[in-house]
C-alpha cells in the first residue's frame, strides 16, 4: 500500500467521506453509513436470474479511479456511479442497467439436439 | 496557523442550556469537519460528534444524541455545540478539534459549569 | 464501541530512561479502507491534548523523533527513547476507525 506522500498515490482526500451503503457496508459501517478516503459510489448489476441488484457503499481511494470508470465487461450487463462533492452524495446516484444488445443472446450457451 | 478559539468559560443553571463556540481561523474552514469532546476530571475524553462544514453532516455519539446539537457558520467560520438540559453531569471542559481522518488541532477548551 | 485499554495508569522514570506505552483495542482498528486510525496525544496539565502520532506510526509536524508508534490490528505501543522533562504530563491513544471514535483512560508520565 502507497504511503501518503508518495507521488503516484492518487490525490488523497482533506478529510474523510461518509457514504450510504447497502449490500455492501463493511464492519466498520454504522447505521448503513461507511466512511471513505475516495468515493461513494451507486451500483446496479444483474444478478444470476437476470433481475437487477443496486448495491451502494464506499470506495477506498485505491484503484477507486479504475472502479469507477465503468469499463463495460463482457457478457456482464453492469453500472456504476461515482461523487464526492458531499457526504451521502450516493443517495442520489442513480445508474441504469446497460441496454441489452442482441449479441446478448446470441453468445449464451448453445444447445445441440 | 490554525487556531481554533473558545471562551474559557461558562456558568450556567441547571435545567437551561448552553451555546458553546469555537472560531477557526489558519486553514479553509470547509476542508475539515470539526469535533467535540468531552472531558471531565479523572473521567477521560469522550467523542460527543463531529459536523462537515461543506454540508452541515452531523455524526453523533448516541449517548450525546439528545443531549448536543451541532451547527456551523461558514461565513465567520465558527462551529457551536449548544447543551440542553443541563445538570451537574454536564460540568465538564469541552473541546472543538479539527478532523481530517484524525484530531490534528484542539481548542483550549470551554470549562462548562453547572450549578444553581 | 472500541474500547482502549491502556497501560500503565502510572508510568515514573528517570530523565533520559526509555518509556513504553500500550495501549489495546478491543477490536481491530484496521479500517475498510486498509488504513488503521490509531493516534497518540500528550496532554500536559491545563492545556488540550497535542497530537503526537497518527495512524500508528507517522510523527506529526515539529514532534522529535524520540516518539515512535508502532502495532498492528488491536495491540499498539507509543515509545520515548529518552524521556525529556518536557515529555511529562499524560498520554491518550485514539482510535478513528469505529464510531463513535474512543479513547484510552490515559497514561501519566511522571518523575521517578
Known amino acids: 500500500k502507497k504511503e501518503d506522500g508518495e507521488s503516484t498515490a492518487p490525490t488523497p482526500r482533506p478529510k474523510v467521506l461518509r457514504c450510504k451503503c447497502h449490500h455492501h457496508c463493511p464492519e466498520d459501517s454504522v447505521n448503513n453509513i461507511c466512511s471513505t478516503d475516495g468515493y461513494c459510489f451507486t451500483m446496479i448489476e444483474e444478478d444470476d436470474s437476470g433481475l437487477p441488484v443496486v448495491t451502494s457503499g464506499c470506495l477506498g481511494l485505491e484503484g477507486s479511479d479504475f472502479q469507477c470508470r465503468d469499463t463495460p465487461i463482457p457478457h456482464q450487463r453492469r453500472s456504476i456511479e461515482c461523487c464526492t462533492e458531499r457526504n451521502e452524495c450516493n443517495k442520489d446516484l442513480h445508474p441504469t442497467l446497460p441496454p441489452l444488445k442482441n449479441r446478448d443472446f446470441v453468445d449464451g450457451p448453445i444447445h445441440h439436439r | 496557523q490554525v487556531q481554533l478559539q473558545q471562551p474559557g468559560a461558562e456558568l450556567v443553571k441547571p435545567g437551561a442550556s448552553v451555546k458553546l463556540s469555537c472560531k477557526a481561523s489558519?486553514?479553509?474552514?470547509?476542508?475539515?469537519?470539526m469535533q467535540w469532546v468531552k472531558q471531565r476530571p479523572g473521567q477521560g475524553l469522550e467523542w460527543i460528534g463531529e459536523?462537515?462544514?461543506?454540508?452541515?453532516?452531523?455524526l453523533y455519539n448516541q449517548k450525546f444524541k439528545d443531549k448536543a446539537t451541532l451547527t456551523v457558520d461558514t461565513s465567520s467560520s465558527t462551529a457551536y455545540m449548544q447543551l440542553s438540559s443541563l445538570t451537574s453531569e454536564d460540568s465538564a471542559v469541552y473541546y472543538c478539534?479539527?478532523?481530517?481522518?484524525?484530531?490534528?488541532?484542539w481548542g483550549q477548551g470551554t470549562t462548562l459549569t453547572v450549578s444553581s | 464501541d472500541a474500547v482502549m485499554t491502556q497501560s500503565p495508569l502510572s508510568l515514573p522514570v528517570s530523565l533520559g530512561d526509555q518509556a513504553s506505552i500500550s495501549c489495546r483495542s478491543s477490536?481491530?482498528?484496521?479500517?475498510?479502507?486498509?488504513?488503521?486510525?490509531l493516534h497518540w496525544y500528550l496532554q500536559k496539565p491545563g492545556q488540550s491534548p497535542k497530537l503526537l502520532i497518527y495512524?500508528?506510526?507517522n510523527r506529526f509536524s515539529g514532534v522529535p523523533d524520540r516518539f515512535s508508534g508502532s502495532g498492528s490490528g488491536t495491540d499498539f505501543t507509543l515509545k520515548i527513547s529518552r524521556v525529556e522533562a518536557e515529555d511529562l504530563g499524560v498520554y491518550f491513544c485514539?482510535?478513528?476507525?469505529?464510531?463513535?471514535?474512543?479513547f484510552g483512560s490515559g497514561t501519566k508520565l511522571e518523575i521517578k
Open positions: 477490536q481491530s482498528l484496521v479500517h475498510s479502507t486498509g488504513n488503521t486510525y
Open positions: 478539534a479539527r478532523f481530517g481522518y484524525y484530531v490534528d488541532y
Open positions: 495512524k500508528v506510526s
Open positions: 485514539s482510535q478513528t476507525t469505529h464510531v463513535p471514535f474512543t
Open positions: 489558519g486553514y479553509t474552514f470547509t476542508n475539515y469537519w
Open positions: 459536523i462537515d462544514p461543506s454540508d452541515r453532516y452531523t
